[in-house]
């Protein structure tokens, strides 16, 4: 009896694992084995596929074959008993294109109101993703074990910290990887659960802000208790993207070590141009808080996000405000090469009732003013980038009197 060729061959590639599955054509024939050959692009000859010779099952693994994952490959299979079937050719494919991203490895650490998530590629030193290691981003789904209400967090890197959680509560999460450059979305990791700890005696510092004064950065934060000491650390933001590396070498800011106030001042030259993460910790001598939320700090934006400079043209019922580039020391204007929005606050000099205008334009009209009345104006700039949500400090207030009633034209 002639053996029939196997049918419906499927190639599954997850990370560096190459799996072949197929259907027997004739279930009634026993003791049949199966063998594969492969052929690379531009070659005429077929080569035996190691790991997939004389297989008795309908599945084989050819991960040991060192292939160029960007090169097209063709496979063929036949059944063997005393005689052999004809070859069945599988559609040619490129391993990289066909490959799926496997589930990442997840390592969790708990605090009282936060969870630190460390994510690593599922296959260490993967050949498939060797050129894409730094391009991986991850997304996760997290939920309270008791409620099951899911929250999704997109576009995170190999280290991510989730804040504002409840103490002594079990949270569960699953993570998947994505290679957006190749339009690939991976499969989810198994579910990992961790319980946050009892509430810490000392809360972490909050509301950390960086501003610029002269040639210095001023770092400020809020704290619940008095008589504390604080320390501040920084880390290059890009280090969060380093796959497989989970040793984060946070560095002290020398002028912000063991400070007794809720602010510290340090020279701008402490940081080269770049994006950094900053965090603050409190201590009362016996106990230490967990670290604060990490804030993103971009020296480019921070250094140049100075309060706007403006001129006022006074009319009887309005001010025309012309916003110019802020001046550096030396009176040279600062070039702002990112979009800004301006917040303008004005009030009658004799009153505390402030009104606010938000504008993208650099010429702004403040309407509905009373003639011959002194109004004061201050302004600040905000970046329009949500991720780098930065604001300058307010400019000094400028006060002007509106003109008499007939000058509005």
């Amino acid at each position: 009896k002639n053996l029939k060729s196997p049918q419906k061959v499927e190639v599954d590639i997850i990370d560096d694992n190459f799996i072949l599955r197929w259907n027997r054509s004739d279930e009634s024939v026993g003791n049949v084995t199966f063998s594969f050959d492969y052929q690379k692009t531009g070659m005429d000859n077929w080569i035996k596929l190691s790991g997939c010779q004389n297989i008795t099952s309908t599945k084989c693994n050819f991960s040991s074959l060192k292939l160029n994952v960007y090169e097209e490959i063709k496979l063929r299979i036949r059944a063997e008993k005393e005689n052999t079937s004809s070859w069945y050719e599988v559609d040619s494919f490129t391993p990289f294109r066909k490959a799926q991203i496997g589930p990442p490895e997840v390592h969790l650490e708990a605090e009282d109101k936060a969870i630190v998530i460390h994510i690593s590629p599922g296959t260490k030193d993967s050949v498939m993703w060797a050129l894409d290691g730094l391009s991986f981003t991850y997304s996760l789904v997290i939920w309270k074990n008791s409620s099951g209400v899911e929250e999704r967090i997109e576009n995170i890197y190999s280290r991510h910290k989730i804040y504002k959680l409840s103490p002594e509560t079990t949270y569960c999460l699953k993570v998947k990887a994505a290679l957006l450059t190749s339009w690939k979305i991976g499969v989810y990791s198994p579910v990992h659960c961790i319980k946050t700890t009892v509430e810490n005696e000392l809360p972490p510092p909050e509301n950390i802000e960086v501003s610029v004064q002269n040639q210095n950065y001023v770092l400020k934060w809020d704290y619940t208790y008095a008589n504390m000491t604080f320390q501040v650390q920084w880390l290059h933001a890009f280090l969060k993207r380093n796959p497989g590396n989970h040793l984060y070498k946070w560095k002290q800011i020398p002028d912000c070590e063991n400070v007794k106030t809720t602010q510290c001042v340090f020279p701008q030259n402490v940081f080269q141009k770049g994006i950094y993460l900053l965090r603050v910790q409190a201590s009362d001598g016996n106990n230490t808080s967990f670290w604060s939320e990490e804030i993103k700090f971009d020296t480019e934006i921070q250094a140049f996000l100075l309060p706007p400079v403006f001129n006022i043209r006074s009319l009887s019922d309005s001010f025309h405000i012309y916003i110019g580039a802020p001046k550096q020391s030396g009176n040279t204007p600062v070039i702002q090469d990112y979009p800004l929005i301006y917040e303008i606050i004005f009030w009658e000099n004799t009153s505390n009732a402030e009104r606010k205008i938000i504008e993208k334009k650099t010429d702004v009209t403040v309407p509905n003013l009373k003639p011959l009345t002194v109004y004061c104006v201050k302004a600040r700039a905000h970046t329009m980038d949500e991720k780098l949500n930065k604001s300058s400090v307010f400019s000094d207030a400028v006060c002007e009197k509106t003109k008499p009633g007939n000058t509005s034209k």
Partner: antibody, heavy 118, light 107 residues
């Protein structure tokens, strides 16, 4: 494979100094921390301090601050511990350890016995 | 400094027994605790890190749990090669501190 090889045993007089070495292989010392830990005879473990060989930043336990100096030479992948003004209670085995992922001291040297005796 | 109080200091047990070693931190250290095994004349060896993660190659009879201030190392069925001293260590804050050790002896 990762290995940490420490210098040999030392017998020193009270008041003197000693410098111990720890040579790493199988990894890039700059990518890790290098720690030193003390274990007195029949006692527990005491963390002395650590260095980041990449920029020589150090941290010390308050007890050892001032008497211990940790340095590193990245060109030879070696970390050093210098102990000064030695006294009898400094007699101990001193271990170096690599600080790796998640801040874990994941690989340890074989230890160096320092005996302080007149 | 954070104190790590380990108990018991000594533990006499037989092969096949289940053993529990506890460690109490003087303040909340999250899950930043490591467990080591040390045999006489040898260097310490990491068993468990981040409170509950077993190092690859460590037998599954070793497990760790706990968070905040209370941590536990369990050996589900003691084997002859497990007779050694066990230390806990916190890695939440400098200076790193160790428990005083638990010596596991054959009964």
């Amino acid at each position: 494979q990762v290995q940490l090889v420490q210098s040999g045993a030392e017998v020193v007089k009270p008041g003197a100094s000693v410098k111990l070495s720890c040579k790493g292989s199988g990894f890039n010392i700059k990518d890790y921390y290098m720690h030193w830990v003390k274990q007195a005879p029949g006692q527990g473990l005491e963390w002395i301090g650590r260095i980041d060989p990449e920029d020589a930043e150090t941290k010390y336990a308050p007890k050892f601050q001032g008497r211990a100096t940790i340095t590193a030479d990245t060109s030879t992948s070696t970390a050093y511990l210098e102990l000064s003004s030695l006294r009898s209670e400094d007699t101990a085995v001193y271990y170096c350890a690599r600080g790796g992922n998640f801040y874990v001291m994941d690989y340890w040297g074989q230890g160096t016995l320092v005996t302080v005796s007149s | 400094d954070i104190q790590m109080t380990q108990s018991p200091s000594f533990l006499s047990t037989s092969v096949g027994d289940r053993v529990t070693v506890t460690c109490k931190a003087s303040q909340n250290v999250g899950t930043n605790v490591v467990w080591y095994q040390q045999k006489p004349g040898k260097s310490p060896k990491v068993l468990i890190y981040s409170a509950s993660y077993r190092v690859s190659g460590v037998p599954s009879r070793f497990s760790g749990s706990g968070s905040g201030t209370e941590f536990t190392l369990i050996i589900s069925s003691v084997q002859p090669e497990d007779f050694a001293t066990y230390f806990c260590q916190q890695k939440n804050n400098y200076p790193y501190t160790f428990g005083q050790g638990t010596k596991l002896e054959i009964k």
